[in-house]
Amino acid sequence: PLATIPVSTTSLTSSEGSTISTPSVDISTPVTTSIVGDQCSRCKNGGFWDGLKCQCLTPYYGESCEEVVNSIDIAPPETVSAQMELTVTVTSVKFTDELKNHSSQEFREFNKTFTEQMNIVYSGIPEYVGVNITNLRLGSVVVEHDVLLRTKYTPEYKTALDNATEVVKQKITKVTTEQIMTNDNCSALMCFNTTGTQVQNITVTQYDPVEECRQKAEEYEDYFLVEYRDQKPYCISPCESGFNASKNCNHGKCQMSQNGARCLCVTTETHWYSGEDCNQGTQKSHHHHHH
């Protein structure tokens, strides 16, 4: 049996010329709904039947997952980070084997003083989060450690973190040049061997909204693009209104197909509309164009 939903219909003509009869309420609502047979087969594009309705995969929606959404939710991380692997040589402490044991009294004290010293060194860097000692070894004390940086996500986050890593390099070079032993003694919180300062590696969070947008758009990847609003990225098709890339369909409805966005032009009681942007109106009674 068929359940028939009565709706008034409006005729839509695609810019290629074919006429599609659709309900005026919502283009995605079918006029008739089959409630018999294999429910799995009615969910298109990889969607699945959950017993009540089709659960659609991105970027599809609609009763049968046959329509393509106008925008895809992409969520950049709130914060992005960088990790710098550094080595410095502390000369104001003599190495002992206990320093290799991270739960020892010696390590805990060294960690506290080293962290305090580094917090002073990097105090002017807003992205600075802290330091993490990864290894201590002989010579006086060679300190392998990570400097952790973090900033709020913006489209320019890489530049911000790159700049911060440069300032870290400058500051650690400065302190390990200035805070050195004099007459075999240190008058600073910690003293260093100038030549023992090395930056081993820098790892920056990789987040590319364009790549995430393209991946989520799947076979429509060529037609979805990223636009920013208030420094937040939006993954949109030209059918999404209110953006620079939005397609203006005038007297029509924008619809995504595998060939991109197209306008489905409406036909009213008095006019029919045509053209790529549905901007050419023809009055039914007089048959003349006006724009």
Epitope: T91, S92, V93, K94, T96, E98, S104, Q105, E106, E109, F110, K112, T113, M181, D184, N185, C186, S187, A188, L189, M190, C191
Partner: nanobody
Framework: DVQLVESGGGVVQPGGSLRLSCAAS????????MAWFRQAPGKEREVVAF????????YYADSVKGRLTISHDNAKNTLYLQMNSLRAEDTAVYYC?????????????????WGQGTMVTVSS
């Protein structure tokens, strides 16, 4: 945690002697650093001397060399400061400080553990 208790302060005449003691407890190792600092009224805290308890290092400020002697008794976990030929400018509160590290710094901020201090007054 490490605890330090000083004793032995007092009033002494110029040229006289005093012996300060500092009893330490809470160490997990027998190899650490101990120091004497002093703070005269209106002045910053300054190092007097420090010692590594393994005997590897001792240090004296130039102003006390030859007059003051730092030593440590490992069996008693006690630090001493033998003060001879005392001068008026030695008047100060003397603090015992310690670190579980073998420190080579005279900056008081590098020393995490402190006693309450004992007053030494050199006056005629």
């Amino acid at each position: 945690d490490v605890q330090l208790v000083e004793s032995g302060g007092g009033v002494v005449q110029p040229g006289g002697s005093l012996r300060l003691s500092c009893a330490a407890s809470g160490y997990t190792s027998n190899r650490y650093s101990m120091a004497w600092f002093r703070q005269a009224p209106g002045k910053e805290r300054e190092v007097v001397a420090f010692i590594w308890t393994d005997g590897g290092r001792t240090y004296y400020a130039d102003s006390v060399k030859g007059r003051l002697t730092i030593s440590h008794d490992n069996a008693k976990n006690t630090l001493y400061l033998q003060m001879n030929s005392l001068r008026a400018e030695d008047t100060a509160v003397y603090y015992c400080a310690a670190s579980s590290l073998l420190l080579q710094t005279i900056n008081p901020r590098a020393w995490p553990y402190w006693g309450q201090g004992t007053m030494v007054t050199v006056s005629s």
